[in-house]
């Protein structure tokens, strides 16, 4: 969490951002909130990116002002116009690219004063893993698949019954480049599993951590998946 203040004490407002991550090819949100003003026409929002000459986005007098917008963000940005009046300056970024990663500044001007805060934005790819029984294998085998990851993640298997066990000798993980030549499909196979035990396939890179669980019993297969973004620090 980054909280920024204006330069002069009497004319400063608090601006708060949250470090976040974008999934390439999908839409992302750069979060920023500020002390709201009564009049929308008195609020100016500027989003800037370190190393980029033009603006990422500008909103003033109740509407977008994109004449100074940098080419790399053309047609890809929007604020939540109806929420600006309540202090939401968050930016929606369409079709996130790897190159969108970096340090952003959310700069706010209102009738109360000015304020800004920086935001670290990471980009990569992350997806939910699905763990299934592999029926093509000769022994009791599980197969964990996740369609899109970048950078290359680590894959670790764990089990509820054998807590702390190292499954690296009885598992095999492969990474297959997807058609756009950036993200990769993750496939990990775990051999010699037993019933009535919950197995977890944990995939992690510096952006996200995802877990797929499976438990096979005589009467059913229970599955659960979970994905968590890392380093979502507020400032």
């Amino acid at each position: 969490l980054i909280i920024g203040f204006g330069i002069s004490g009497r004319h400063s407002i608090t601006v708060t951002t949250v470090a976040s991550a974008g999934n390439i090819g999908e839409d992302g949100i750069l979060s920023c909130t500020f002390e709201p003003d009564i009049k929308l026409s008195d609020i100016v929002i500027q989003w800037l990116k370190e190393g980029v000459i033009g603006l990422v986005h500008e909103f003033k007098e109740g509407k977008d002002e994109l004449s100074e917008q940098d080419e790399m963000f053309r047609g890809r940005t929007a604020v939540f116009a109806d929420q600006v009046i309540v202090g939401n300056a968050s930016l929606r970024l369409k079709n996130v690219q790897l190159t969108d990663a970096g340090t952003y500044k959310c700069y706010i001007i209102t009738s109360k004063g000015k304020g800004n805060a920086n935001l670290e934005y990471k980009t990569g790819a992350f997806s939910m893993p699905e763990v299934n029984v592999d029926y093509n294998a000769s022994s009791e085998t599980l197969r964990c698949e996740a369609p899109r990851w970048f950078p290359q993640p680590t894959v670790v298997w764990a089990s509820q019954v054998d807590q702390g066990a190292n499954f690296s000798e009885v598992s095999n993980t492969s990474f297959e480049l997807n058609s756009e030549n950036v993200t990769m499909k993750v496939v990990s196979v775990l051999y010699n599993v037993t019933i009535n035990n919950t197995y977890s396939c944990m995939i992690e890179n510096d952006i996200a951590k995802a877990t797929g669980d499976i438990k096979v019993t005589e009467s059913e297969i229970k599955r659960r998946s979970h994905l968590q973004l890392l380093n979502s620090k507020a400032s």
Partner: nanobody
Framework: EVQLVESGGGLVQPGGSLRLSCAAS????????MHWVRQVPGKGREWVSR????????SYEDSVKGRFTISRDNAKNTVYLQMHGLRAEDTAVYYC???????????????WGQGTLVTVSS
């Protein structure tokens, strides 16, 4: 209550054929893989064949491949084992059983019927 009732066994000459049936009740048949297991009198049980819930995937123990065919009729909650080219070593009590997956370790199976005896002899 899970019930599995096997039928269709009998005495057959070597090279002959039989069709075993297993009528299932007490559970949602289409949620389960169905398996055939056999037991030679005085010996342990041996897995024979399996079929997926929708019938699209089947597999067999090596010694019966090409001779036995597993099938199922989900409308009738019944699984079948068609046996051709029977040999003396196929003599056994045949059981059907269910499991949530295609895994087929004998110790995983919990529900058994009374079995049906197949005797191959001249």
């Amino acid at each position: 209550e899970v019930q599995l009732v096997e039928s269709g066994g009998g005495l057959v000459q070597p090279g002959g054929s039989l069709r075993l049936s297993c009528a299932a009740s007490g559970f949602t048949f289409t949620d389960f893989w169905m398996h055939w297991v056999r037991q030679v009198p005085g010996k342990g049980r041996e897995w024979v064949s399996r079929i997926s819930p929708d019938g699209s995937s089947t597999s067999y123990e090596d010694s019966v491949k090409g001779r036995f065919t597993i099938s199922r009729d989900n409308a009738k909650n019944t699984v079948y084992l068609q046996m051709h080219g029977l040999r003396a070593e196929d003599t056994a009590v045949y059981y059907c059983t269910r499991f949530s997956t295609g895994w087929h370790r004998i110790e995983y199976f919990q529900h058994w019927g009374q079995g049906t005896l197949v005797t191959v002899s001249s």
